[in-house]
């Protein structure tokens, strides 16, 4: 039994890091393998992650981590029984994929203005809380070409757009994702989408 593709890990910079790897053949990851991980710090304890299958030869493990901070570094040991298959390390702050924003809501009752709001996925004491910026994707269910991205580079989790920038009388969907420049993160997954019917009063013709 050998590792074909070494584990690569990403952290949500809060409580979970996800590691994925591939074996050289079909493997029952949960019964044959264990991923041991330990913070390189005084008094830290070793933890064991039981991997799940991710395709025939692929495995995935969700590592639970307490109090993730930028200085943290973890040792990783992949075991098959008594055999050490791979040894490595992982610094969560260097491989961050933020959590997806939640609670996306479209407020349509503000005088021909659409107000989109969502929730920051981090608590205020997490470093990423004040460092997320967002991308909002709005698209028409009727017209695949009517697809737009708004970059929200300020910290407030909201976006105002004029209803008239979208077509009236049709349904639109929106979703939002996040990233943080400070840690050069990847983009989060998209939030669940929300749907609304866009309608606004056309201005009177002179």
């Amino acid at each position: 039994m050998k590792v074909l593709q070494e584990p690569t890990c990403v952290s949500d910079y809060m409580s979970i890091s996800t590691c994925e790897w591939k074996m050289n053949g079909p493997t029952n990851c949960s019964t044959e393998l264990r991923l041991l991980y330990q913070l390189v710090f005084l008094l830290s304890e070793a933890h064991t992650c039981i991997p799940e299958n991710n395709g025939g030869a692929g495995c995935v493990c969700h590592l639970l981590m307490d109090d993730v901070v930028s200085a943290d570094n973890y040792t990783l040991d992949l075991w098959a029984g008594q055999q050490l298959l791979w040894k490595g390390s992982f610094k969560p702050s260097e491989h961050v994929k933020p959590r997806a924003p939640g609670n996306l809501t479209v407020h349509t009752n503000v005088s021909d203005t659409l107000l989109l709001t969502w929730s920051n996925p981090y608590p205020p004491d997490n470093y990423l809380y004040n460092h997320l910026t967002y991308a909002v994707n709005i698209w028409s269910e009727n017209d695949p070409a009517d697809f737009r991205i708004y970059n929200v580079t300020y910290l407030e989790p909201s976006l105002r757009i004029a209803a008239s920038t979208l077509k009236s009388g049709i349904s639109y969907r929106a979703r939002v994702r996040a990233w943080a420049q400070c840690y050069n993160t990847t983009w989060s997954e998209w939030s669940p989408s929300t749907k609304w019917h866009n309608s606004y009063r056309e201005p009177f013709e002179q």
Partner: antibody, heavy 116, light 111 residues
Amino acid sequence: QVQLVQSGAEVKKPGASVKVSCKASGYAFTSYYMHWARQAPGQGLEWMGIINPSGGSTSYAQKFQGRVTMTRDTSTSTVYMELSSLRSEDTAVYYCARGKWWLDYWGKGTLVTVSS
Amino acid sequence: QSVLTQPPSVSAAPGQKVTISCSGGSSNIGNSYVSWYQQLPGTAPKLLIYDNNKRPSGIPDRFSGSKSGTSATLAITGLQTGDEADYYCGTWDTSLSANYVFGTGTKLTVL
């Protein structure tokens, strides 16, 4: 919000022991290390040791080895620092502080006075 | 006797900039993460800077930290009377066993 509430001031005689408590709230108690530090009147900060509330393991500054004991009670989210064989130079404000590589939240401090 | 040395005192007028140095060695600053703490008169210390140069939420950007080799610096711009306090650097030291160490402390006076 994170709060560390320490026990009240103590007056002790030389040779006695003192046990200071620090009750944590507003976060997952076992997920964060806790430090103890002290500050003698008009002096700087001095680190005493650290406890991992998850397993209860501890590490103490060499100066306090054999005299200090740090414990925790996960049922009440409280850590304790006991210092024995007190002498007058142990008169200080004792602080608990949460953190690992740095100390991000501090208790208000407990004044321990050692006097005959 | 702390292994991290700071100037005992610094002073400057309101609106000015002041820097506080923290000098250590390869077993502490040179090999770990520096944090800075502010202690206003009669209160507990408060985290001001961590991981050498990061600010916790709520700390204004007038406060900044840097590290080079075995020394670290705290800079405060646009000095305010409310900044008058004691400032301590801190880091882990691994010379014998692992210990957290604080600097000797610096008293900032706003003239």
